[in-house]
Amino acid sequence: MRRERGRQGDSSSCERQVDRVNLKPCEQHIMQRIMGEQEQYDSYDIRSTRSSDQQQRCCDELNEMENTQRCMCEALQQIMENQCDRLQDRQMVQQFKRELMNLPQQCNFRAPQRCDLDVSGGRC
């Protein structure tokens, strides 16, 4: 189907939605992916929660938002921002970013275009 895109909801609308959802399961899911199932991630008590469960919870939370590329981008950027200080080195940052980029696909959403995940002012 051919379509011309109109506006996708303004930034404040997406910001409100991102503020409203709980992104912790997404953060935990990604940290588990990059740390490995065996290692503990001491910022959260995740020992009893398998990564696949966290992924489902993450997808459920993201599903609460308006399904636009703009809002998805804001959510991913917020996750990156939240976890930035916990990522210990450049390699970990890159791993986290790679997993973050795969998140929409894992949740059967379309990956956002034009989404700059380097949002931490050089900290990450």
Epitope: E4, R5, E74, M101, A111, Q113, R114, C115, D116, V119
Partner: antibody, heavy 123, light 110 residues
């Protein structure tokens, strides 16, 4: 070598129509976003419209939406800009550009530009 | 009036370094990638920087890009007389669903 050659520029009266064409060569046309950008005499650059690789998505500058239509023929490697209800504000050099935007986690950037074609709207 | 703000002009002597700023908002530079263009008099613009910091092949490393928050910066070191041109920043604005260009900065090499 990538080449973008615009044609169709002219002097046209206010309220008139014009169709610009851009013949592309030297790359696989069907795999790139394409973009029209214009520049009024002595002024800065102004983005006009984007079109996705398969033509399924189009974006327009607010002031041209509903008057201009961007389209493409991937079989011929040609980009078009149909311009209707033209006004003096539409006067300028129109550039056909290749847009490096990919499907995710990248931005719009214009890595190849045509030489530009002059559109003058005046009575 | 451009939504992306650039200084109208900057100048420096040959061999010196110059920076050109591009200021926007959260809905454009803050969330999206920035590119930079050089337009020599009477010619079509040329891409210098894309995705904030990347240089296309053929662009010397005298040119660099950076981004922090809602602002971006183009740096040019070892200025040459051939660098005299207009420089434009550009990015997507998610609220407008449009690409925005800055108003342009005229670089004079003294």
């Amino acid at each position: 070598e990538v080449q973008l050659v615009e044609s169709g520029g002219a002097l046209v009266q206010p309220g008139g129509s014009l169709r610009l064409s851009c013949a592309a060569s030297g790359f696989k046309f069907s795999t790139f976003y394409m973009t029209w950008i214009r520049q009024a005499p002595g002024k800065g650059l102004e983005w006009v419209a984007n079109i996705k690789q398969d033509g399924s998505e189009k974006d327009y500058l607010d002031s041209v939406r509903g008057r201009f239509n961007i389209s493409r023929d991937n079989a011929k490697s040609v980009l078009y800009l149909q311009m209707n209800t033209l006004s003096a504000d539409d006067t300028g050099v129109y550039y056909c550009t290749r847009n490096g935007l990919q499907d995710s986690y990248s931005g719009d950037f214009f890595d190849h530009w045509g030489q530009g074609i002059l559109v003058t709207v005046s009575s | 009036q451009s939504v992306l703000t650039q200084p109208p002009s900057v100048s420096a002597a040959p061999g010196q370094k110059v920076t050109i700023s591009c200021s926007g908002t959260g809905s454009n530079i803050g969330h999206n990638y920035v590119s930079w263009y050089q337009q020599l008099p009477g010619t079509a613009p040329k891409l210098l920087i894309f995705d904030n910091t990347k240089r296309p092949s053929g662009i010397p490393d005298r040119f660099s890009g950076s981004k922090s928050g809602s602002s971006a910066t183009l740096g040019i070191t070892g200025l040459q007389t051939g660098d005299e041109a207009d420089y434009f920043c550009a990015t997507w604005d998610a609220d407008l669903s449009a690409v925005l260009f800055g108003g342009g900065t005229k670089l004079t090499v003294l």
